[in-house]
């Protein structure tokens, strides 16, 4: 028998520095977690203690904090090289800055293979990107070899900016021939490493003949055997065992997100490459594991540029950006409009001639808007200003909801109106009219939504049975501010870009902004 230790991360999303327990900015260092300096300590310890170790990343290193905003992926290459990752799969967010924003900072700089079998380049890009990412890689580990085959969510064109010269094929269809090729090369230990979410990970384990282990990402799935060490609730045991169509037991793993855990899976193979046993658990990277002082010193060196960036002007406003709770929790506020407009702008994807865009709607809890921005400071808007407006380090995500769920969400928005509560929704691509004289749960008297399957966008009544795409904060997607109906009834959820980054990019693009209060939210009674 031959034993392999698989260490794995996924959806790190730019958390290079240690974070608080909820993966936001670290405040009390003695209770902080994760970060590359701490990850390094643990990885090195395991490498020293065990003979056959692979360190793998299942994608979405890009996007999530000011680190990515400023360094644009150079930080990912540098610190992943420093940690000596053995392989990485491409995630959807790796395309957030276009193909060039992937090629230059990461693909050309990484000292480890970057993989995806289901992304095919065409046209002029094919020769430019050739060899910079691979469908698979055979890695020597001790006296053996292990094949790693990569995959990426085929939804990436809707979630990011891969451009028109990359084709995202069905994962299973693309993986099978690559695995078969590895088998012909006498590679009998094969790991599928990818970024399509837990459901697809399980399907790959079931359907792709020859895959021994699946290491996934995208869905931020937390798996654990025994009592979990922090706040995350396990979606199943670690590893999650799938019985393949040809009768094999295939372990499937994922390690939550944000570098909070290091996945740790031990696999025992027989001499023919069959999995005999698998066991392990994610390791919580808490403060019982010190940050390596040398990696920490490197982080501190890179940090200097971030501090300078946060005070630089992104653009100007010529109007007061009303982000006060007195406005945003009671009525349409222009800060809410600005943020929603930025959220839609960030999701412009012309992937189908029938649609002007795949999504037109935005909802945003008023309680998530934490500060106004005064235009009388020469109109200057900085990252620091935006961090005061959006201090929670969330993301603006894409969900699919039925019209009936949206209607419930808008009823919840005003079910206890007048108490300055955070659930009052700011909107984009939506016209809503409330009648507060009616009883809670029956106050939405008009709800029109902007069409997507149209050449000239216009507002049409919401259809209860239709499925709509909506951009919203991850906080709402997870049922925050009482929006349990969104969490319970959403049909799809893909995590998006860092909230501040979305707004800052929009302001930089527009250069001068002047958002108005324009009648997106109305009240049908005269007193409002």
């Amino acid at each position: 028998a031959w034993e392999l230790t698989i260490l794995h991360t996924n959806d790190v999303h730019s958390r290079l520095e240690q974070t608080s327990e909820d993966s936001s900015k670290c405040v009390n260092a003695s209770r902080c977690m994760g970060g590359v300096a701490r990850l390094f300590t643990k990885v090195q310890q395991i490498r020293r203690a065990e003979p056959n170790v692979l360190l793998l990343d299942a994608g979405d290193q890009y996007q999530g904090t000011i680190w990515f905003t400023v360094y644009k992926g150079a930080e990912v290459a540098h610190f992943m090289n420093a940690l000596r990752y053995d392989a990485m799969a491409l995630g959807n967010h790796e395309f957030d800055n276009g193909v060039e924003g992937l090629i230059e900072p990461l693909l050309k700089e990484a000292k480890f293979p970057i993989l995806s079998a289901n992304i095919k380049a065409k046209g002029p890009l094919a020769s430019q990107i050739s060899g910079l990412y691979l469908p698979y890689k055979v890695l020597p580990v001790g006296d053996e070899v292990v094949g790693i085959v990569g995959y990426t969510s085929k939804e990436t064109p809707f979630l990011s900016n891969p451009g028109t010269n990359l084709v995202f094929e069905d994962e299973i269809t693309a993986l099978q021939p690559e695995v078969d090729k590895l088998k012909t090369l006498n590679v009998n230990k094969i790991i599928a490493l990818g970024h399509s979410g837990f459901e697809m990970d399980k399907l790959i384990a079931q359907k792709v003949r020859g895959v021994d282990v699946v290491v996934g990402g995208h869905s931020n799935t937390f798996l654990y055997t025994g009592n979990p060490p922090s706040k995350e609730v396990p979606a199943g045991k670690y590893p999650f065992i799938v019985t393949s169509d040809d009768g094999r037991k295939v372990p499937v793993v994922q390690a939550y997100a944000f570098g909070k855990y290091l996945g740790y899976l031990k696999i025992e193979f027989d001499e023919r490459g069959n999995v005999i046993s698998s066991h392990g658990n994610p390791i919580l990277l808490n403060s019982s594991i010190p940050e390596d002082p040398s990696i920490k010193a490197d982080i501190n060196k890179w940090r200097i540029k971030l501090d300078n960036y946060s005070t630089q002007e992104l653009g100007k406003t010529i109007v007061y950006l009303d982000g006060s709770s007195q406005s945003c929790r009671f009525r349409e506020c222009n800060m809410g409009n600005l943020i929603c407009d930025a959220m839609i702008n960030n999701n412009l994807r012309h992937t189908d001639e029938m649609f002007w865009n795949h999504v037109s709607m935005c909802i945003l809890n008023g309680g998530g808007i934490r500060s106004p921005i005064d235009e009388r400071n020469n109109g200057t808007i900085t990252w620091e200003n935006l961090a005061a407006v959006l201090p929670f380090g969330g993301t603006f995500d894409l969900v699919q909801l039925k019209g009936s769920t949206l209607k419930k969400a808008f009823e919840h928005s005003v079910h206890r109106y007048g108490q300055s509560t955070g659930e009052f929704l700011q909107v984009g691509g939506i016209h809503v009219v409330y009648d507060l004289s009616r009883k809670p749960g029956d106050r939405v008297v008009k709800l029109d939504v902007l069409c997507t399957k149209c050449r000239v966008p216009s507002y049409d009544p919401l259809k209860m049975d239709e499925v709509y795409k909506v951009i919203l904060p991850n906080f709402l997607a997870n049922g925050g501010d009482g929006f349990q109906m969104i969490k319970d009834e959403l049909l799809r959820h893909d995590s998006g870009d860092q909230d501040i980054n979305v707004v800052s990019t929009y302001i930089s693009k527009m250069k001068v902004i002047y958002p108005a209060v324009e009648g997106r939210i109305k009240f049908s009674t005269g007193s409002h």
Epitope: R48, P293, K296, D298
Partner: antibody, heavy 121, light 111 residues
Framework: QVQLQQSGAELMKPGASVKISCKAT????????IEWVKQRPGHGLEWIGE????????NYNEKFKGKATFTADTSSNTAYMQLSSLTSEDSAVYYC??????????????WGQGTSVTVSS | DIVLTQSPASLAVSLGQRATISCRAS??????????MNWFQQKPGQPPKLLIY???NQGSGVPARFSGSGSGTDFSLNIHPMEEDDTAMYFC?????????FGSGTKLEIK
């Protein structure tokens, strides 16, 4: 067992450069930091900096930036430190040491025997 | 940078007696409940040898008569009973943060 074998003593002219080697045996070279330390009589021990060979990460003491350059060759398990623009201030014994990680505690657990560099015209 | 101040600069102790060397850091070298303070012994013509790591843990093959204590900014190395072979220079060193720094050293002799 773990051993660090350094190159022999050097007598150099001012303005020249010298490259000191440190060959590691008895452990996985790429997994441990190599530290470089300077010792001049009456000046105690001074940390110059470090290199992690497998990952080729370096950290330098600000005082030695531009003076010392670290490299490593994982095929021969050898770390190198080059000292440039030598002056009499660089006359010292230079040590390489492995930074251990027993319980994460980052102590220099094994040392080379030292390389004496004398700068004289 | 963290400055380490060692005292005394030199010390003479009778065989069989206790030798105590102190090291004070300009700021705490504690982190994560660990004191990142190490002690080295150096004899003439030889490289330093690790005696104590993390304030109180003995290095490999170090005799039990060497012990370390302290936390935060104040640390001490104790040698008891003093033996002939213990004549040497002793250095403290912090590994909490880069740049790593050493104390100026204490010369220990037999009285």
């Amino acid at each position: 067992q773990v051993q660090l074998q350094q190159s022999g003593a050097e007598l150099m002219k001012p303005g020249a450069s010298v490259k000191i080697s440190c060959k590691a045996t008895g452990y996985t070279f790429s997994n441990y930091w190599i530290e470089w330390v300077k010792q001049r009589p009456g000046h105690g021990l001074e940390w110059i900096g470090e290199i992690l060979p497998g990952n080729v990460i370096t950290n330098y003491n600000e005082k030695f930036k531009g003076k010392a350059t670290f490299t490593a060759d994982t095929s021969s398990n050898t770390a190198y430190m080059q000292l440039s623009s030598l002056t009499s201030e660089d006359s010292a014994v230079y040590y390489c040491a492995r930074r251990g990680d027993d319980g994460y505690l980052y102590a220099m657990d094994y040392w080379g025997q030292g390389t004496s560099v004398t700068v004289s015209s | 940078d963290i400055v380490l101040t060692q005292s005394p600069a030199s010390l003479a102790v009778s065989l069989g007696q206790r030798a105590t060397i102190s090291c004070r850091a300009s700021e705490s070298v504690d982190n994560y409940g660990i004191s990142f303070m190490n002690w080295f012994q150096q004899k003439p013509g030889q490289p330093p040898k690790l005696l104590i790591y993390a304030a109180s843990n003995q290095g490999s093959g170090v005799p039990a008569r060497f012990s370390g204590s302290g936390s935060g900014t104040d640390f001490s190395l104790n040698i008891h009973p003093m033996e002939e072979d213990d004549t040497a220079m002793y250095f403290c060193q912090q590994s909490k943060e880069v740049p790593f720094t050493f104390g100026s050293g204490t010369k220990l002799e037999i009285k």
